[in-house]
């Protein structure tokens, strides 16, 4: 399960403080649940690890956009 994330409701309490290279990322999930203390992103890496990140950071937003474009381009 994601680093620093609760099981019952997926929340991020701590976020990674370093950039993950885009080529290591597979997908992401937005966390906006009201029961979570903050909005966050959970990135899933190609090795299957899940990591919380702060969407206010530029690299996080750029990575999300990159993944959006890849996902859309993979569609038939």
């Amino acid at each position: 399960q994601p680093d620093s994330v609760s099981i019952a409701i997926t929340c991020c309490f701590n976020v990674i403080n370093r950039k993950i290279p885009i080529q290591r990322l597979e997908s992401y999930t937005r966390i906006t649940n009201i029961q979570c203390p903050k909005e966050a992103v959970i990135f899933k890496t190609k090795r299957g690890k899940e990591v919380c990140a702060d969407p206010k950071e530029r690299w996080v937003r750029d990575s999300m956009k990159h993944l959006d474009q890849i996902f859309q381009n993979l569609k038939p």
Epitope: P37, K56, D68, Q69, Q72
Partner: antibody
Framework: QVQLVQSGAEVKKPGSSVKVSCKAS????????MHWVRQAPGQGLEWMGR????????KFDPKFQGRVTITADTSTSTAYMELSSLRSEDTAVYYC??????????WGQGTTVTVSS | DIQMTQSPSSLSASVGDRVTITCKAT??????LAWYQQKPGKAPKLLIS???SLETGVPSRFSGSGSGTDYTLTISSLQPEDFATYYC?????????FGGGTKVEIK
């Protein structure tokens, strides 16, 4: 739970300014972005701009650039939107909303601003 | 700026009807689309984000679909409380823009 409570209705003269407040509870505003959206009578929704309360960084629709100021006070969990050089077309309901991703999951109740001579 | 064109601007329907509202962007928005419901005198309520993700507490009769520039909101069986105005909004790039709205009225 999250609540965004806005200041009361305002009646303003053309050429003047208005400042609307939005007090948040149930969340730390420095963790999110606070946006302002307006809606003229019988019209659709129009995004004006947003602030990152953690550092004061703002982004605006170019249509409002130079006429709108968005500020935030993290000590009181309050965001503010000031619109200057008011004209009759600025008569609208002004909403604050939160959302770091660019969509808005919690909204204030709205503040009616009427611009009339 | 990305323009959002919503259609129809209004529609009349009966309770139990299936209702479809469409939204077209002037460029690819990569599923960064939200749908809102607004009732008179009230703030908008977020229904769907990311084109398809239903918000917590939103009834399952609401669904979103689409990709690229074309997106759809469907209400599978219209209920009395669903009569309202619906807006789409792109959040791919600022300035964030809304569609013109679709007013769903009682037939």
């Amino acid at each position: 739970q999250v609540q965004l409570v806005q200041s009361g209705a305002e009646v303003k003269k053309p050429g003047s300014s208005v400042k609307v407040s939005c007090k948040a509870s149930g969340l730390t505003i420095s963790d999110t972005y606070m946006h302002w959206v307006r809606q003229a009578p019988g019209q659709g929704l129009e995004w004006m701009g947003r602030i990152d309360p953690a550092n004061g960084n703002t982004k605006f629709d170019p249509k409002f650039q130079g006429r709108v100021t968005i500020t935030a006070d993290t000590s009181t969990s309050t965001a503010y939107m000031e619109l200057s050089s008011l004209r009759s077309e600025d008569t609208a309901v002004y909403y604050c909303a939160r959302g770091v991703f660019g969509f808005f999951d919690y909204w204030g109740q709205g503040t009616t601003v009427t611009v009339s001579s | 700026d990305i323009q959002m064109t919503q259609s129809p601007s209004s529609l009349s329907a009966s309770v139990g009807d299936r209702v479809t509202i469409t939204c077209k962007a002037t460029e690819d928005i990569y599923n960064r689309l939200a749908w809102y419901q607004q009732k008179p005198g009230k703030a908008p309520k977020l229904l769907i984000s990311g084109a398809t993700s239903l918000e917590t507490g939103v009834p399952s009769r609401f669904s979103g679909s689409g990709s690229g520039t074309d997106y759809t909101l469907t209400i599978s069986s219209l209920q009395p409380e669903d009569f309202a105005t619906y807006y789409c909004q792109q959040f791919w790039s600022a300035p964030y823009t809304f569609g013109g709205g679709t007013k769903v009225e009682i037939k």
